[in-house]
């Protein structure tokens, strides 16, 4: 898996809803692939991490003053929805096809 | 200034274009306020860091498995433009009124 020594990339992160206490309201799925953005944002920032101008500037300032300014951070830049079956306020199972922002689609340096 | 022990927030970062080698093409300004997003994304994630569902999930998984999964990261979530005067290939000064993504407007946990 990608550590701090490798460049920013999307890695697997299986999330079990019981582990995070969400099994009290999410009926299904029991777990899902959330993914995680891992790795460093090293100079020079590659196109595949879609850096903003600010991220490029911060990377250059970090090169010059590494103790004063941090590197840009590897984070989700695009998220995908999942479908979930959950209990509503009255305990009725309800299907939400598009439960937004639950899974990483793309990672980048920000 | 905000360190890793404080919560995610926008802090000052004055960038001098000479320091990053951009003075070769940016005539003015000589420096600008880029800001930096600093601090941790701690549980529970506050509304002011506008967490995505994925960031909330990752924070909860980190609580459960701190060595396996990292915390969400404090990054710019909204950027502002600045106006820059730059030299073109012929050395002619040209103005970019709306040079996007150069300064942090808002920070959040992603």
């Amino acid at each position: 898996s990608a550590g701090a020594g490798s460049h920013c990339q999307k890695t697997s992160l299986r999330v079990n809803f019981e582990d995070i206490g969400w099994d009290s309201w999410i009926i299904a799925p029991k777990e899902y692939e959330a993914y995680e953005c891992k790795g460093g944002c090293f100079f020079p920032l590659a196109d595949d991490v879609t850096p903003t101008k600010h991220a490029i500037v911060q990377t250059l300032v970090h090169l010059k003053f590494p103790t004063k300014v941090g590197k840009a951070c590897c984070v989700p830049t695009k998220l995908s929805p999942i479908s979930v079956l959950y209990k509503d306020d009255m305990g009725v199972p309800t299907l939400k096809y598009h439960y937004e922002g639950m899974s990483v689609a793309e990672c980048g340096c920000r | 200034s905000a360190g890793a022990g404080s919560h995610c927030q926008k802090t000052s970062l004055r960038v001098n274009f000479e320091d990053i080698g951009w003075d070769s093409w940016i005539i003015a300004p000589k420096e600008y306020e880029a800001y930096e997003c600093k601090g941790g994304c701690f549980f529970p994630l506050a509304d002011d860091v506008t967490p995505t569902k994925h960031a909330i999930v990752q924070t909860l998984v980190h609580l459960k498995f701190p060595t396996k999964v990292g915390k969400a990261c404090c990054v710019p979530t909204k950027l502002s433009p600045i106006s820059v005067l730059y030299k073109d290939d012929m050395g002619v000064p040209t103005l970019k009124y709306h040079y996007e993504g150069m300064s942090v407007a808002e920070c959040g946990c992603r």
Partner: antibody, heavy 114, light 110 residues
Framework: EVQLVESGGGLVKPGGSLRLSCAAS????????MSWVRQAPGKGLEWVGR??????????DYAAPVKGRFTISRDDSKNTLYLQMNSLKTEDTAVYYC?????WGQGTLVTVSS | QSVLTQPPSASGTPGQRVTISCSVT????????VHWYQQLPGTAPKLLFF??YRPSGVSDRFSGSKSGTSASLAIVGLQSEDEGYYYC???????????FGGGTKLTVLG
């Protein structure tokens, strides 16, 4: 020497159309973000819109009063900037300048009147 | 009503120092990006000052400063050829382009 020369102005009836041109020389036109700025008779300056360089997407942005009626385009092979003005109103009467922000043309007068 | 407020007129005698102010009254405008244009009678506007950059051909009698939400243009050793209109301009983030002040007509007396 940088030169911007506008042309195409004239008298047009309300609801009519006009296309302005701006011939550029003395700088790398293809890399420049180009704007149109107008000045109504006896009034101040008003930004009309801007086009980025093609290498930066060639995106256009417009001021609210002209959005949907005016279109900015560029032909880098001819070093020329254009402003297509449709559905003209009397309040569009002005001298229209093309500019890099640092350099300005001499302007061309557009009069919208019946 | 312009979001950059200038006095409609200013005057002075030859050799005097004149200051023209430009006040920001809109949060979409950052005073940092404010700059100045000169328009002499019957001519196109000309960039006078952008941050600390003065285009070649512009006299060093012109200088710009910024404080709080105001920018100022100072002209020392006033000359009859300085007569004309002076416009401040800023970057309107919402509009994604420049916005101009209403202009100040400078008259050189005597």
């Amino acid at each position: 020497e940088v030169q911007l020369v506008e042309s195409g102005g004239g008298l047009v009836k309300p609801g009519g159309s006009l296309r302005l041109s701006c011939a550029a020389s003395g700088f790398t036109f293809s890399n420049a973000w180009m704007s149109w700025v107008r000045q109504a008779p006896g009034k101040g300056l008003e930004w009309v819109g801007r086009i980025k360089s093609k290498t930066e997407g060639g995106d256009t942005d417009y001021a609210a009063p002209v959005k949907g009626r005016f279109t900015i385009s560029r032909d880098d092979s001819k070093n020329t900037l254009y402003l297509q003005m449709n559905s003209l109103k009397t309040e569009d009467t002005a001298v229209y300048y093309c500019t890099t922000g640092t350099y300005w043309g001499q302007g061309t007068l557009v009069t919208v009147s019946s | 009503q312009s979001v950059l407020t200038q006095p409609p007129s200013a005057s002075g005698t030859p050799g005097q120092r004149v200051t023209i102010s430009c006040s920001v009254t809109n949060t979409d405008i950052d005073i940092f990006n404010v700059h100045w244009y000169q328009q002499l009678p019957g001519t196109a506007p000309k960039l006078l000052f952008f941050h600390d950059y003065r285009p070649s051909g512009v006299s060093d009698r012109f200088s710009g400063s910024k404080s709080g939400t105001s920018a100022s243009l100072a002209i020392v050793g006033l000359q009859s050829e300085d007569e004309g209109y002076y416009y401040c301009a800023g970057l309107d983030e919402a509009m994604r382009g420049p916005v101009f002040g209403g202009g100040t007509k400078l008259t050189v007396l005597g």
